[in-house]
Interface confidence: low
């Protein structure tokens, strides 16, 4: 049914929904502490602007006694449930905040007709691309397997000079919803990645896993997981490695590779880290003081989610023209914002774009050293280490079937 | 979750062009990511076609890439298979199957519908 909207005569609101099931275990407090602070930010943005309107935001709470595992994979009413809650009570903003879990947010979509702007920090899951009012402030599963794709054919760098067509996946069903996502995405049958690989397996057991680091049969070097160190280590321990096997390990948003005092575990020397290139300025931010490092990604997206709004406010009222349209709807996405962080850029299907980093670690000094980014707005490849210390034979990346390339 | 029920089958000459349809049920269709699969006795299910809600994204396995052309109608709820230049190798059942984008399997298949390719 429609729902009418607070959203005219001086007074903007964003509905923002507060979920128990959330795509990471993150305080609510914290999220409403990154709202509000998204909320000074916009409010002064739009005075400077000299347009003199208010802008607020309303927090909407699940029942927690309905939906408290905190777990994704159960969120798949919670996001209705909300929306129902929000018409009994006549009470939608000009812009929806959330859901986070792509389940939510893809039967939202199946059940509502959305005639607003929904921002989500999270949905990473391919079936929540191309929503037409959908905008995604986190990485989403495609740009990662754009990603992918580009560097296993890459061949012309010093440093990978094989084109690689084959890759075993690590999933073994236990993984954060990001991680989720991103490794369903790479199993699906059907998709750009499985597409472009002559050959792929998942490896579901940790003892699968285990066997391939030396099996002389295996059919690709390269193992493709997603987590943090500790979970690699779980898996691996100080297990003996072939030396040309090659593990991507998938960590976007955690930062600790960049801190100062890091040193990487011996048992990283064969592995390249993927990871999102860090921001500059949450570290001493208010509402970040709290957070981990992987938890910082999600609260900032929550406050971009609010500048985001703010700059699309901005731009419609200095234009004249109605919030509660669906060329309002539909505007959240083929730009550029300035925000928290500096300028977020947002593709033709409203996904955010990043730079993504690969890392690897230096036999020399034990340190994470960045081997080259990845733009995903241009879907390009920007080598950063021409001669890198590496593990690997050469200081090349290995073929990715043995026998053929430096063993 | 979607219904899918194909059409369009036969019996056509090699060399020869047939469209198949597949019509699903529900108003959710572009939510979905469409395929076209296909079975010949006694061989496996093998990979035709699919194409993504909006049509934004098509894949074709290495056997049709070049003959075989998929398309959808959202408005229509219908997605579409043209097979052009077919061989006898293409005799088989064709399955249309909806699911969401990127879950490791579609999770609704039609009841398929026979081509044969012969002279």
């Known amino acids: 049914s429609q729902v009418s909207q607070n959203c005219h005569n001086g007074s903007y609101e964003i509905s923002v929904l507060m979920m128990g099931n959330s795509a990471f275990a993150e305080p609510l407090k914290n999220l409403e502490d990154a709202v509000n602070e998204g909320l000074e930010i916009v409010r002064g943005r739009l005075q400077n602007a000299g347009l003199n309107v208010t802008v607020n935001a309303t927090f909407m709470y699940s029942d927690g006694l309905i939906h408290n595992s905190g777990d994704c994979r159960s969120s798949t009413c919670e996001g209705l449930d909300l929306l129902r809650k929000i018409s009994n009570a006549q009470r939608m903003g000009c812009v929806l905040i959330g859901p986070s879990c792509t389940y939510s947010t893809f039967q939202m979509y199946l059940d509502t007709e959305l005639s607003y702007p929904m921002i989500s920090a999270g949905s990473f899951g391919l079936s929540c691309d191309y929503k037409e009012t959908l905008t995604r402030l986190m990485s989403p599963a495609r740009k990662l397997m754009y990603f992918l794709v580009n560097f296993w054919k890459t061949n012309d760098l010093p440093f990978k000079t094989y084109s690689w067509s084959t890759s075993y996946v690590y999933k073994n069903g236990t993984e954060t919803e990001d991680c989720f996502w991103y490794l369903n995405a790479l199993e699906a049958s059907v998709s750009y990645f499985s597409h472009e690989l002559g050959f792929k397996v998942v490896l579901r057991q940790d003892k699968e896993f285990q066997d391939i680091l030396m099996d002389h049969n295996r059919k690709s070097n390269v193992i493709i997981m997603c987590g943090g160190p500790e979970f690699l280590y779980k898996l691996k321990g100080d297990r003996a490695v072939a030396e040309d096997i090659v593990i991507i390990l998938v960590d976007l948003f955690n930062d600790q590779y960049f801190e100062d005092n890091v040193t990487a575990p011996d048992y990283m020397k064969n592995v390249l880290v993927l990871t999102l290139s860090p921001g500059n300025s949450l570290l001493n931010s208010s509402f970040s003081r709290n957070l981990s490092p992987t938890k910082r990604d999600f609260a900032l997206a929550y406050l971009n989610g609010i500048l985001l709004f703010g700059h699309m406010l901005k731009i419609f009222l200095e234009n004249g023209e109605n919030i509660t349209t669906p060329k309002f709807a539909h505007a959240f996405r083929n730009l550029t914002f300035e925000g928290y962080d500096g300028p977020v850029t947002l593709d033709d299907w409203g996904d955010v774009d990043s730079t993504m980093v690969l890392l690897y670690t230096s036999v020399d000094t034990k340190k994470y050293k960045v081997l080259l980014t990845y733009d995903t707005h241009v879907n390009k490849t920007y080598p950063v280490d021409m001669s890198p210390t590496f593990t690997w034979k050469n200081s090349k990346l290995p073929n990715d079937i043995t026998g053929r390339g430096p063993q | 979750e979607v219904q899918v029920v194909e059409s369009g089958g036969g019996l056509v000459q090699p060399g020869g062009s047939l469209r198949l349809s597949c019509v699903a049920s529900?108003?959710?269709?572009?939510?979905?990511?469409m395929g076209w699969f296909r079975q010949a006795p006694g061989k496996e299910r093998e990979f035709v076609a699919a194409?993504?809600?909006?049509?934004?994204?098509?894949y074709y396995g290495d056997s049709v890439k070049g003959r075989f052309t998929i398309s959808r109608d959202n408005a229509k709820n219908t997605m579409y298979l043209q097979m052009n230049r077919l061989k006898p190798e293409d005799t088989a059942v064709y399955y249309c199957?909806?699911?969401?984008?990127?879950?490791?399997?579609?999770?609704?298949w039609g009841q398929g519908t026979q081509v044969t390719v012969s002279s």
């Open positions: 194409i993504s809600g909006s049509g934004g994204s098509i």
């Open positions: 199957a909806a699911g969401p984008l990127g879950s490791p399997d579609f999770d609704s």
């Open positions: 529900g108003r959710t269709f572009s939510s979905y990511a």
